[in-house]
C-alpha cells in the first residue's frame, strides 16, 4: 500500500522537517528558517510561533516541531498552547479580578495559582486536628481519640484562632 501510495503521490515520501516543493518538481525541500512540519507529506511548512513580550521561549522551534512559550516572570500559562498569561499570587492567596487577595479564614492555598480551598474537616472522618491549618496549609488530621491506646497523650485541637490582622472576606 505504501508503495502504491508513493507512486500516486510523491509527496508522501517527504519526511517531517521537509515539504513537497511544487516549484521544484515535487521534490522534498527542507523547511525554511523559522518554519516547521511536524508530519510527513506536507505541501508547506508552518511558520513557527514567536514567544515575545508577555511570552518567553520555553522550547525553540525546530524543523519538525513548533516553538513552545511560557510566561514572563510573575505569570503562568493559561489557555491552549499558553495563549495568555495569568498573574501568580503568593501561597495563602487567590487571584481575583482586582489582584491577589489573602485566603479567608478557614481556607488555604498552597500554590501560586488556583483558588483558596476549605480546610479539611477532620471530624467528618472521625478524626481530630493534629496540626492547625493556615492560609498556606491544610489542617493535618490525627487519629480519633478512640484510636489512641490507653495512656497515650491525646492532642487537643486548639480553638482555631484568627491570624493577626486577618479578617474573613
Amino acid at each position: 500500500f505504501e508503495r502504491t501510495r508513493s507512486l500516486q503521490d510523491p509527496c508522501s515520501n517527504c519526511p517531517a522537517g521537509t515539504f513537497c516543493d511544487n516549484n521544484r518538481n515535487q521534490i522534498c525541500s527542507p523547511c525554511p528558517p523559522n518554519s516547521f512540519s511536524s508530519a510527513g507529506g506536507q505541501r508547506t511548512c508552518d511558520i513557527c510561533r514567536q514567544c515575545k513580550g508577555v511570552f518567553r521561549t520555553r522550547k525553540e522551534c525546530s524543523s519538525t516541531s513548533n516553538a513552545e512559550c511560557d510566561c514572563t516572570p510573575g505569570f503562568h500559562c493559561l489557555g491552549a498552547g499558553c495563549s495568555m498569561c495569568e498573574q501568580d499570587c503568593k501561597q495563602g492567596q487567590e487571584l481575583t479580578k482586582k489582584g491577589c487577595k489573602d485566603c479567608c479564614f478557614g481556607t488555604f492555598n498552597d500554590q501560586k495559582r488556583g483558588i483558596c480551598r476549605p480546610w479539611t474537616n477532620c471530624s467528618l472522618d472521625g478524626k481530630s486536628v493534629l496540626v492547625n491549618g493556615t492560609k498556606e496549609r491544610d489542617v493535618v488530621c490525627g487519629p480519633s481519640p478512640a484510636d489512641l491506646s490507653p495512656g497515650a497523650s491525646s492532642v487537643t485541637p486548639p480553638a482555631p484562632a484568627r491570624e493577626p490582622g486577618h479578617s474573613p472576606q
Epitope: D46, Q50, K52, V54, C71, G79, S83
Partner: antibody, heavy 124, light 107 residues
C-alpha cells in the same frame, strides 16, 4: 489612563519620506512585556500591520514594506517614531499605533489599546 | 506571512439576529487569534483574544471559538451598536496579520 496618540503631517508629496510619532502615556516603553505596532488602513480597506517594536528594541517588519520602513523609540520621551520612505499615492491611509502586552491579572499579546489614528494623504 | 480569510465580507442582519463570522488561517495557529470591532472613523476595539477570551468590558453576547485554522466570532443577539466592521488577527508571529474584514450592515 493608558493612551497612544499619533502625530505627523497630514499631506506628503510622492517620493517624500513620512515621519510619524506615537506618544504614549500611562505605561512605560521600557516594560519588557510591552510592544508597540504601527498599523495602517487605506480608505474603505482592511487593516495592515506595518512594523512592531519591543522594549528590547527587537523589530518586526511587514514583508512587503520592509525596505521602506524604519522604527525607533525614545523611552525617556515615551515616543515611538515610524519613518516610511518614497511615499506613493497608494500609501494614503489612516495610520494607527497600538500597544500589545496587556496589563492586569490576565495578560496577552493582542492590541488592547489603540491611538485614534492620523490620516495621511499622498498627493502632489 | 500567515493569510487570514474572513467570510462573509458583507452581512446584512436585523437587531436580535444571531450573527456568525468565520476566519480561516492559511496554516494552523492553535488559539492565537484575536477579534476586533471597528466603527466608521474610529480605531479598532479589541473584543476577543486567545480565540475565545472576552476582553474586559465587552458584552457577553460576543463569543469566539475555534482552533487551528478555523475560527468563528458569534454575536448571539445583534444590538444597534453592533453594526460595524469586524477583523480577525493572528497572534502566532510577527508581523501580525489581519483578515480583510466583515462589514455587518442593517437589513
Amino acid at each position: 489612563q493608558v493612551t497612544l496618540k499619533e502625530s505627523g503631517p497630514v499631506l506628503v508629496k510622492p517620493t517624500e519620506t513620512l515621519t510619524l510619532t506615537c506618544t504614549v502615556s500611562g505605561f512605560s516603553l521600557s516594560n519588557a512585556r510591552v510592544g508597540v505596532s504601527w498599523i495602517r488602513q487605506p480608505p474603505g480597506k482592511a487593516l495592515e500591520s506595518l512594523v512592531h517594536i519591543f522594549s528590547n528594541d527587537e523589530k518586526f517588519f511587514s514583508t512587503s514594506l520592509k525596505s521602506r520602513l524604519t522604527i525607533s523609540k525614545d523611552t525617556s520621551k515615551s515616543q515611538v517614531v515610524l519613518t516610511m520612505t518614497n511615499m506613493v499615492p497608494v500609501d494614503t491611509a489612516t495610520y494607527y499605533c497600538a500597544r500589545n502586552g496587556g496589563f492586569g491579572v490576565i495578560i496577552h499579546d493582542a492590541f488592547d489599546i489603540w491611538g485614534q489614528g492620523t490620516m495621511v494623504t499622498v498627493s502632489s | 506571512d500567515i493569510q487570514l480569510t474572513q467570510s462573509p465580507s458583507f452581512l446584512s442582519a436585523s437587531v436580535g439576529d444571531r450573527v456568525t463570522i468565520t476566519c480561516r488561517a492559511s496554516q494552523g495557529i492553535s488559539s492565537y487569534l484575536a477579534w476586533y470591532q471597528q466603527k466608521p472613523g474610529k480605531a479598532p476595539k479589541l473584543l476577543i483574544f486567545a480565540a475565545s477570551t472576552l476582553q474586559n468590558g465587552v458584552p457577553s453576547r460576543f463569543s469566539g471559538s475555534g482552533s487551528g485554522t478555523e475560527f468563528t466570532l458569534t454575536i448571539s443577539s445583534l444590538q444597534p451598536e453592533d453594526f460595524a466592521t469586524y477583523y480577525c488577527q493572528q497572534l502566532n508571529n510577527y508581523p501580525r496579520t489581519f483578515g480583510q474584514g466583515t462589514k455587518v450592515e442593517i437589513k
